[in-house]
């Protein structure tokens, strides 16, 4: 049984300084651990590359909104 207390924590220490096209993005996850120095978003691209981004930036927020909409279940 894995020990959750010792589970590794992923942190972002630097953010991308380039805006990523939403067409290249597949998903995102938040980094909110108090063990990390920065609040962050990790985008996963369609080629499975992970990129750290600053959640304070508008393009990051807009990209999260775009990805959220793709999770909607169509209404019948």
């Amino acid at each position: 049984q894995p020990d959750a207390i010792n589970a590794p924590v992923t942190c972002c220490y630097n953010f991308t300084n380039r805006k990523i096209s939403v067409q290249r993005l597949a998903s995102y996850r938040r980094i909110t651990s108090s063990k990390c120095p920065k609040e962050a978003v990790i985008f996963k691209t369609i080629v499975a590359k992970e990129i750290c981004a600053d959640p304070k930036q508008k393009w990051v927020q807009d990209s999260m909104d775009h990805l959220d909409k793709q999770t909607q279940t169509p209404k019948t």
Epitope: Q61, D62, D65, L67, D68
Partner: nanobody, 123 residues
Framework: EVQLVESGGGLVQAGGSLRLSCAAS????????MGWFRQAPGKEREFVTL????????DYTDSVKGRFTISRDNAKNTVSLQMNNLKPADTAVYYC????????????????WGQGTQVTVSS
């Protein structure tokens, strides 16, 4: 860590209006999708409405469409729910929630929750 505090609940007669507010602190408010959920006595918590980070997209459960309006002020770290033409069936504890995770309107998509505010609609 995001903290959420709701206010504005109360007792209102059927056909009346209430405006709920939710004040957020901690984290970057404009980076969270915000939602309102409600839980009536003896029932499961259910989605009411949500608003995207930009405020440009909203969604509502069918039973409140045309009566409820969600809005947000990213400068003031607040999200509001204007409730008009209230019905006894709207009686519930209303919860403000913040979503950092990818998703839409499922409870599991929301990471942070307020303590709730009671709305009672009498006939």
């Amino acid at each position: 860590e995001v903290q959420l505090v709701e206010s504005g609940g109360g007792l209102v007669q059927a056909g009346g209006s209430l405006r709920l507010s939710c004040a957020a602190s901690g984290g970057t408010f404009s980076s969270y999708r915000m939602g309102w959920f409600r839980q009536a006595p003896g029932k499961e918590r259910e989605f009411v409405t949500l608003i995207s980070r930009s405020g440009g997209t909203t969604d509502y459960t069918d039973s409140v469409k045309g009566r409820f309006t969600i809005s947000r002020d990213n400068a003031k770290n607040t999200v509001s729910l204007q409730m008009n033409n209230l019905k006894p069936a709207d009686t519930a504890v209303y919860y403000c929630a913040a979503a950092g995770s990818m998703g839409w309107n499922h409870l599991r998509d929301y990471d942070y929750w307020g303590q709730g505010t009671q709305v009672t609609v009498s006939s």
